[in-house]
């Protein structure tokens, strides 16, 4: 008789999840010499240990501590790029500007990017059918707690000038419910971070508005200001040109506003 299985509202664990995590770990450690000491089997065991046999609505940051310890990585604290609702462009940027890093350019972020996972209470099975949805089911699910944990640590590590890429096409350019709005912005350390610089990415070609005057951007400045961190904001009117100019900064068209 098949065991009754909890039906959650979100998609189930990504197929071939263990193999994917392990393969990504091997690939990352091969590409990044500073992480060659990492034992990927131990990383997988620690990852698995964070959620296997645990109720997927009762996961804590503590569950991920063994994984955090194994994945400890030093990135230049003054080269951090945060992003909100504009992941692809942020990743395209750091692929070109190799000395800057998003969370997904670190080992732990790279391992989990775009993946879903959860287990079941009291069984060693991975649930490939469904996993809890943050809104409809619970916020303390394996995926949400993982990203909250690594995002907090990433923001805490930042120093000097921290950049954040924001999506100017959205109704809430700065959204308090995003990982940036709910976790990262509150975990920047004022004793280390001097300035938060927002890059607001425009969507339409004819969009010449100053989105740095958007009320949600002023809201972001207000939050940051109380923590004694300076705030600056730039409109990126032409993201395509912006990327092109990062690749070829000496191009004559790159002196004008992008």
């Amino acid at each position: 008789v098949p065991r009754w299985r909890q039906q959650w509202s979100g998609p189930g664990t990504t197929k071939r999840f263990p193999e994917t995590v392990l393969a990504r770990c091997v690939k990352y450690t091969e590409i990044h010499p500073e992480m060659r000491h990492v034992d990927c089997q131990s990383v997988w065991d620690a990852f698995k240990g964070a959620f296997i046999s645990k109720h997927p609505c009762n996961i804590t940051e503590e569950d991920y501590q063994p994984l955090m310890k194994l994945g400890t990585q030093t990135v230049p604290c003054n080269k951090i790029l945060l992003w909100s609702r504009i992941k692809d462009l942020a990743h395209q940027f750091t692929q070109v500007q190799r000395d800057m890093f998003t969370l997904e350019d670190t080992l732990l972020g790279y391992l989990a990017d775009d993946l879903t996972w959860c287990g079941e209470f009291n069984t060693s099975k991975i649930n490939y059918q469904s996993c809890p949805d943050w809104r409809k089911d619970c916020s303390n699910n394996p995926v949400s707690v993982f990203w909250k944990t690594v995002s907090r640590r990433f923001a805490e590590a930042a120093c000097d000038v921290v950049h954040v890429m924001l999506n100017g096409s959205r109704s809430k350019i700065f959204d308090k419910n995003s990982t940036f709005g709910s976790v990262e912005v509150h975990n920047l350390q004022p004793e280390k971070v001097q300035t938060l610089e927002a890059w607001v990415i425009h969507g339409g070609r004819e969009d010449s508005r100053d989105l740095c005057q958007d009320p949600t951007i002023k809201e972001l400045e207000s939050i940051i200001s109380k923590r004694n961190i300076q705030f600056s904001c730039k409109n990126i009117y032409r993201p395509d040109k912006f990327l092109q100019c990062v690749k070829n900064p000496e191009d004559s068209s790159c002196t004008s506003e992008i």
Partner: antibody, heavy 118, light 109 residues
Framework: EVQLLESGGGLVQPGGSLRLSCAAS????????MNWVRQAPGKGLEWVSA????????YYADSVKGRFTISRDNSENTLYLQMNNLRAEDTAVYYC???????????WGRGTTVTVSS | QSVLTQPPSASGTPGQRVTISCSGS????????VNWYQQLPGTAPKLLIY??QRPSGVPDRFSGSKSGTSASLAISGLQSEDEADYYC???????????FGGGTKLTVL
């Protein structure tokens, strides 16, 4: 002239409700985070609540959490404080004040008096 | 009991310099915005100092400083019109709240 004007105070019995208003003029209300601060008779200042520019974020002192609700109407340039289940210890002058980034609460109203007594 | 600690009273004679201290913690004064407010008898508070700066219109007799988890307000060349209550305030990142000191009553003798 930059001005904040509170209204809605009065005498109310314990367990009762009041709604305070704060009308802003002379500045762009929708550019500022807003606050309520109170002062009990003969006592110091106590921050009560704050609301962000768009109203997305609200903050409350532990002493009023679950009883008071802050809100704003940017089209009417007005800040509100809905006070329910009032207690004797809520008796105070209630001030509204804006928050200017990197400065602090730089414009204050004259205050409205709330008395909770049976 | 206030999150920020101030002496309840301070005094000085005209022309003197007085200092009012404000003690807090890492989650407020050390890392976040610090303000000083002046409240003259029967009036609303007025912003006097933000961090260590003076808003326009505040005499340069008033100055603010900050060291670690403590802040100080100094008033030089004390005048009779400086007799008022003085409050320190700071954003507390742990509480997600503004916190005030208990206030210091300044008497000009």
């Amino acid at each position: 002239e930059v001005q904040l004007l509170e209204s809605g105070g009065g005498l109310v019995q314990p367990g009762g409700s009041l709604r305070l208003s704060c009308a802003a003029s002379g500045f762009t209300f929708s550019d500022y985070e807003m606050n309520w601060v109170r002062q009990a008779p003969g006592k110091g200042l106590e921050w009560v609540s704050a609301i962000s520019i768009t109203g997305s974020w609200t903050y409350y002192a532990d002493s009023v959490k679950g009883r008071f609700t802050i809100s704003r109407d940017n089209s009417e340039n007005t800040l509100y404080l809905q006070m329910n289940n009032l207690r004797a210890e809520d008796t105070a002058v209630y001030y509204c004040a804006n928050y200017k980034s990197y400065y602090g609460m730089d414009v204050w109203g004259r205050g409205t008096t709330v008395t909770v007594s049976s | 009991q206030s999150v920020l600690t101030q002496p309840p009273s301070a005094s000085g004679t005209p022309g003197q310099r007085v200092t009012i201290s404000c003690s807090g913690s890492r989650s407020n004064i050390r890392n976040n915005l610090v303000n000083w407010y002046q409240q003259l008898p029967g009036t609303a508070p007025k912003l006097l100092i933000y961090n260590t700066q003076r808003p326009s219109g505040v005499p340069d007799r008033f100055s603010g400083s900050k060291s670690g988890t403590s802040a100080s307000l100094a008033i030089s060349g004390l005048q009779s019109e400086d007799e008022a209550d003085y409050y320190c305030a700071s954003w507390d990142a742990s509480l997600n709240a503004w916190v005030f000191g208990g206030g210091t009553k300044l008497t000009v003798l």
